[in-house]
Interface confidence: low
């Protein structure tokens, strides 16, 4: 229904706390360099204005669209051009072009320092002094670093953060209470960020149809007892929610997500038997829980898929008369039978099925042509299964750090032109798949591994798009989203690459490395490893292992030495010489 004042409508629906949080996220995601105080001031002004519209929907400007209201606020910021350069040109445009312009200027890799967590006492003090401001800072800092973070989900993580602080700040040993809990939230939030970015990429590059196909597959796996109409309705609603969030319409997105959660909880009987525990929770927890709910038990009496999609005499007629619905039904039926497949694999199978029908339905004897289509799926299924087995075996043998290093070597060989920080970040993220997925029960490994890898590779593509340097990466990133992972997996050593010359300073280290946290130490070592591979792309695993073991031994020795500086300055050059010799 149309509302006289959109801003009043959203304020009433969401309530002041969520309204303010979402407006803060929106501003922080658009203008990523502004300070918290600048954004907080704008949020307060917008909130005060919303309240006047709630009191009187006919008041001046209350009938304006949210994009107009928010855009006008952003464009009124002083020194916009000095701080944001050509983003200021967006302000010369009218809606909806102005908002599109803001979206295009979102930076996936803003040059902001890492979000450092203060020590426990300081955190608890500022949290107790002003919990609202503290959580505002959290929303601001996360949103500006992750400009596509799913806004209602970020409110959920802020709520988790709040609960953890409330509990831990009351304890004697705050540090040991806070650290593991906040680390857990951080890990989940980072995964949530890359997953949502993938959804927005799908929406931006391939449109709503592509996203809806993803949603149908995912929902069919989770709710195999829901009928196709129910799945389609949920997929349509979910597509709308994600389109709004990816498009910066965060108030609408959060409101519609709450509506979707309400609908699901009111219609459990036709959706899934597993929703009740989620539905008993308050709003943010409920929506989060529904998004991660376990798969319902598959119906026992499902007929073979071939009956409707291969053996039926009307296959080509069905396909010709309702392509999208027929393919959607195929995707639904196949997905609900295979919770053990990744969504990416299911979409590849649906694409193969579509291509087969396109070809066969134009032939003289279609059934003879498409009769073998399900058998032709076999290599498509085997490929990711082998990938999971190979990589999980390697992870189990090497552990997370060693597995990351193996991936780093592999990807540096595939795309040596890519910057070392990007390669290290990608390899570290890709390597976490082991810890995240390889320990799961067998039937959950493939979906976990492949869908996670796809999301990480999407980030690689986004960063590479900014400064394209590798033809290999460009080739894999240009294709369809679901083909990316197999494309990257199939890449081999880039034969066109001219090895980097050996620079001693790249492998020169100082005593300050000794005091770094373990994670930072690992990054330093992995940076050196990537540089070694760039110097010798065809170095054997044995050669690289020798050098890295020597390097680890060198660090261990010098970090234990009484005079660390002298040890680093004398032993360092010897290490460099040994490295060169080992790789010669």
């Amino acid at each position: 229904e149309a509302h006289k004042s959109e801003i009043a409508h959203r304020y009433n629906d969401l309530g002041e706390q969520h309204f303010k949080g979402l407006v803060l996220i929106a501003f922080s995601q658009y203008l990523q360099k502004c300070s918290y105080d600048e954004h907080a001031k704008l949020v307060q002004e917008v909130t005060d204005f919303a309240k006047t519209c709630v009191a009187d929907e006919s008041a001046a400007n209350c009938d304006k669209s949210l994009h107009t209201l928010f855009g006008d606020k952003l464009c009124a910021i002083p020194n916009l051009r000095e701080n944001y350069g050509e983003l200021a040109d967006c302000c010369t445009k009218q809606e909806p072009e102005r908002n599109e312009c803001f979206l295009q200027h979102k930076d996936d890799n803003p040059s902001l320092p890492p979000f450092e967590r203060p020590e426990a006492e300081a955190m608890c003090t500022s949290f107790k002094e002003n919990p609202t401001t503290f959580m505002g800072h959290y929303l601001h800092e996360v949103a500006r670093r992750h400009p596509y973070f799913y806004a209602p989900e970020l409110l959920y993580y802020a709520e988790q953060y709040n609960e953890i602080l409330t509990q831990c700040c009351a304890e004697a040993d705050k540090e040991s209470c806070l650290t593991p809990k906040l680390d857990g939230v951080k890990e989940k939030a980072l995964v949530s960020s890359v997953r949502q970015r993938m959804k927005c990429s799908s929406m931006q590059k391939f449109g709503e149809r592509a996203f809806k196909a993803w949603a149908v597959a995912r929902l069919s796996q989770t709710f195999p007892n829901a009928d196709f109409a129910e799945i389609t309705k949920l997929a349509t609603d979910l597509t709308k929610v994600n389109k709004e969030c990816c498009h910066g319409d965060l108030l609408e997105c959060a409101d519609d997500r709450a509506e979707l959660a309400k609908y699901m909880c009111e219609n459990q009987a036709t959706i899934s038997s597993k929703l009740q525990t989620c539905c008993d929770k308050p709003l943010l927890k409920k929506a989060h829980c529904l998004s991660e709910v376990e798969h319902d038990t598959m119906p026992a009496d499902l007929p073979a898929i071939a009956a409707d999609f291969v053996e039926d005499q009307e296959v080509c007629k069905n396909y010709a008369e309702a392509k999208d619905v027929f393919l959607g039904t195929f995707l639904y039926e196949y997905s609900r039978r295979h919770p053990d497949y990744s969504v990416s694999l299911l979409l590849r199978l649906a694409k193969k099925y579509e291509a087969t029908l396109e070809k066969c339905c134009a032939e003289a004897n279609p059934p003879a042509c498409y009769g073998t289509v399900l058998a032709e799926f076999q290599p498509l299924v085997e490929e990711p299964k082998n990938l999971v087995k190979t990589n999980c075996d390697l992870y189990e043998k090497l552990g997370e750090y060693g597995f990351q290093n193996a991936i780093l070597v592999r990807y540096t060989q595939k795309a040596p032109q890519v910057s070392t920080p990007t390669l290290v970040e990608a390899a570290r993220n890709l390597g976490r798949v082991g810890t995240k997925c390889c320990t799961l029960p067998e039937d959950q490994r493939l979906p976990c591994v492949e869908d996670y890898l796809s999301a990480i590779l999407n980030r690689v593509c986004l960063l590479h798009e900014k400064t394209p340097v590798s033809e290999h990466v460009t080739k894999c990133c240009s294709g369809s989203l679901v083909e990316r992972r197999p494309c990257f997996s199939a890449l081999t050593v880039d034969e066109t690459y001219v090895p980097k010359e050996f620079k001693a300073e790249t492998f020169t280290f100082h005593s300050d490395i000794c005091t770094l946290p373990e994670k930072e130490k690992q990054i330093k070592k992995q940076t050196a490893l990537a540089e070694l591979v760039k110097h010798k792309p065809k170095a054997t695993a044995e050669q690289l292992k020798t050098v890295m073991d020597d390097f680890a031994q060198f660090l261990d020795t010098c970090c234990k030495a009484a005079d660390k500086d002298t040890c680093f300055s004398t032993e360092g050059p010897n290490l460099v010489t040994r490295c060169k010799d080992a790789l010669a």
Partner: nanobody
């Protein structure tokens, strides 16, 4: 540090039921992956059932599916294993295990669980 204490074991006739409990301290049980394992005399320790943290995703060994139910009571910080239709081959020492590093991940591999209870003996015999 997580401490786990199992209880509820005992002697039961075939076809009977038992409910095992595992009280946790040092960590909220809904934030960690927890599982039940069992070890029969002279055999390897085997996975029985598991439940993920944060989201109540449950896992079962094929041999107990439909007979055993894993659950937890967050307010009591306790994990349960309801065992129905017990068979003589269910005789074993039952252990509760926790894996706080991966709150959502339940694994069937015993080595991946750093925290264990001392076990409770279940004997199914007529």
């Amino acid at each position: 540090e997580v401490q786990l204490l199992e209880s509820g074991g005992g002697l039961v006739q075939p076809g009977g039921s038992l409910r095992l409990s595992c009280a946790a301290s040092g960590r909220y049980i809904d934030e960690t992956a927890v599982a039940w394992f069992r070890q029969a005399p002279g055999k390897e320790r085997e996975f029985v059932a598991g439940i993920g943290g944060g989201v109540d995703i449950t896992y079962y060994a094929d041999s107990v599916k439909g007979r055993f139910t894993i659950s937890r009571d967050n307010s009591k910080n306790t994990l349960y294993l309801q065992m129905n239709s017990l068979r003589p081959e269910d005789t074993a020492v039952y252990y509760c295990a926790a894996r706080p590093g991966s709150p959502l991940i339940t694994s069937k591999v015993a080595d991946l669980y750093p925290y264990w209870g001392q076990g409770t003996l279940v004997t199914v015999s007529s």
